[in-house]
């Protein structure tokens, strides 16, 4: 997978008036990395590993960049003409990637009230607008403003692309991201399925990087894909990932089944626990925690694009 840096900024307006402040998160390699603390008006690392990336350096540069980006986005929202009464949001997601072959990609996406209306490839400067008439109107609005704004010239987009990549390279240079491996905790549970059957679920949690093999084996041989159910590999909010795999087996045949896990060159096998069948949920309920986002987002059900 490529290394990536993703900026996620949101600004709000109420009855056509742009609210002060902004929400910002930065993800490094898909993990929550920085968050803008609106009380302290500073960029804050998300967890110990994020702190380790910069070591003893300060987060002043990140604070300055996020503050500048937030200000730009508030100005952009102010120029969106069709703001009706009530609450509205403008979200900007900017991503840059460095691939294994050292090639790079950069893009920028704008969402209004959770709906994508404008994307730009920051390398080719090519804009893309969804088909809907609302998106077309919004996109024209924003593009006109960006053209008017002397800062938003070709040079500006090249700079955005270059800055993002420069920051990503700076973070990778610390080596923390590259050499970081956290082995998974693996846990096998069983639950009642139907008459004579049980569902066995194998969960792997708190692992990094995200690449993992998790599969059920019968007599040491992997079960076919169609007899297993997999969960997505999802961030767990601690800079690590979680996933699960489940299958249905005949009661009494538990001894034949093991969960096989392979991660970062290490592997393990985990038997089905014997004994009383526990009535457990066989699938995780995945809650997306948004790391202290403003309550107004929850209250107004504004979509947050991950």
């Amino acid at each position: 997978e490529p290394h990536s840096l993703r900026y996620n900024l949101t600004v709000l307006s109420w009855d056509g008036s742009v609210q002060s402040g902004f929400l910002a998160e930065v993800h490094l390699d898909g993990q929550p990395f920085l968050r803008y603390d609106r009380q302290k008006c500073r960029a804050k690392p998300q967890g110990q590993w994020a702190e380790d990336v910069l070591g003893n350096k300060t987060w002043d540069r990140e604070t300055r960049d996020l503050t500048g980006n937030g200000k730009d986005l508030r100005m952009t929202l102010a120029h969106i003409k069709d703001q009706k009464e009530g609450l509205h949001s403008l979200q900007e997601i900017r991503v840059c990637e460095i691939h294994e072959d050292n090639s790079t990609r950069s893009s920028q996406h704008f969402y209004y009230d959770g709906e994508l209306f404008l994307s730009q490839n920051l390398e080719t400067e090519e804009w893309t607008v969804p088909q809907s008439s609302r998106a077309q109107t919004l996109a024209m609005n924003v593009r006109n403003f960006l053209k008017e704004d002397a800062m938003k010239t070709k040079t500006h987009y090249h700079a955005m692309h270059a800055d993002c990549l420069q920051e990503l390279r700076r973070y990778l240079e610390s080596g923390v991201v590259l050499r970081r491996t956290v082995p998974p905790m693996v846990n096998v549970t069983r639950s009642e399925a139907s008459e004579g059957n049980i569902t066995v679920t194998c969960r792997a949690s708190s692992f990094y990087p995200r690449n993992i093999i998790l599969t059920w084996r019968q007599d040491g041989v992997s079960l076919s894909h169609d007899t297993q159910q997999w969960g997505d590999v999802l961030p767990d909010g601690n800079g690590t990932y979680q996933t699960w795999v489940a299958t249905r087996i005949c009661r009494g045949e538990e001894q034949r089944f093991t969960c096989y896990m392979e991660h970062s060159g290490n592997h393990s096998t985990h038997p089905v626990p014997s004994g009383k069948v526990l009535v457990l949920q066989s699938h995780w309920q995945h809650h997306h925690h948004h790391h202290g986002l403003n309550d107004i987002f929850e209250a107004q059900k504004i979509e947050w694009h991950e």
Partner: antibody, heavy 118, light 107 residues
Framework: QVQLQQSGPELVKPGASVKVSCKAS????????IYWVKQSHGKSLEWIGY????????VYNQKFKGKATLTVDKSSSTAYMHLNSLTSEDSAVYYC???????????WGQGTLVTVSA | DIQMTQTTSSLSASLGDRVTITCSAG??????LNWYQQKPDGTVKLLIF???SLQSGVPSRFSGSGSGADYSLTISNLEPEDIATYYC?????????FGAGTKLELK
């Protein structure tokens, strides 16, 4: 490539015990089960049991419970089958086998002849 | 235990022949069936797994088919190195069980 090298032939007395070894090479030993199979002279194959080298977990054919004990030594990538209270019925060629994770008994050892005779 | 029956204990064929070896299980085994070849020197090799999947490195003249309780192994064009004993094996239920074997000889 995957290889399973078994110990040499054994001539043992009735009532005694024997330990057959199976040294694995060419793959990560703890990744895949080791299976044991018996073939009496001129007869078919019988599955004895298997062991998971990662955690030592075993599953036996009921018929061989109490007769065979499966163990592993991870440090030398070697699996062992201990046969006790031997009788002439236990005279046979014993095979170890492993898997590639997709099919049973994918790779086989060359077999170990155990002869029980007074 | 699931009984695996190979009705033909020995079979004579000529080089180039198409040979079919059959195997039936005491009950349905959901295609959980493998085929093995044992050479006269005792060497054992997996040929087919899960009824019809050809093991890597096995010549394509070998094929497997079947469902329910009845299965077969076919050698489309018999070669000298195919002279061996062939065993079917089920892994639907424990204990894992093998057929009695079919010894293939040259006419």
């Amino acid at each position: 490539q995957v290889q399973l090298q078994q110990s040499g032939p054994e001539l043992v007395k009735p009532g005694a015990s024997v330990k057959v070894s199976c040294k694995a090479s060419g793959y990560a030993f703890t990744k895949y089960n080791i299976y044991w199979v018996k073939q009496s002279h001129g007869k078919s194959l019988e599955w004895i049991g298997y062991i998971d080298p990662y955690n030592g977990g075993t599953v036996y054919n009921q018929k061989f419970k109490g007769k065979a004990t499966l163990t592993v030594d991870k440090s030398s990538s070697t699996a062992y089958m201990h046969l006790n209270s031997l009788t002439s019925e236990d005279s046979a060629v014993y095979y170890c086998a492993t898997t590639d994770g997709y099919s049973l008994f994918t790779y086989w050892g060359q077999g170990t002849l155990v002869t029980v005779s007074a | 235990d699931i009984q695996m029956t190979q009705t033909t204990s020995s079979l004579s064929a000529s080089l180039g022949d198409r040979v079919t070896i059959t195997c039936s299980a005491g009950q349905g085994i959901n295609n959980y069936l493998n085929w093995y070849q044992q050479k006269p020197d005792g060497t054992v090799k997996l040929l087919i797994f899960y009824t019809s999947s050809l093991q890597s490195g096995v010549p394509s003249r070998f094929s497997g088919s079947g469902s329910g309780a009845d299965y077969s192994l076919t050698i489309s064009n018999l070669e000298p190195e195919d002279i061996a004993t062939y065993y079917c094996q089920q892994y639907s239920k424990l204990p894992l069980t093998f057929g009695a074997g079919t010894k293939l000889e040259l006419k």
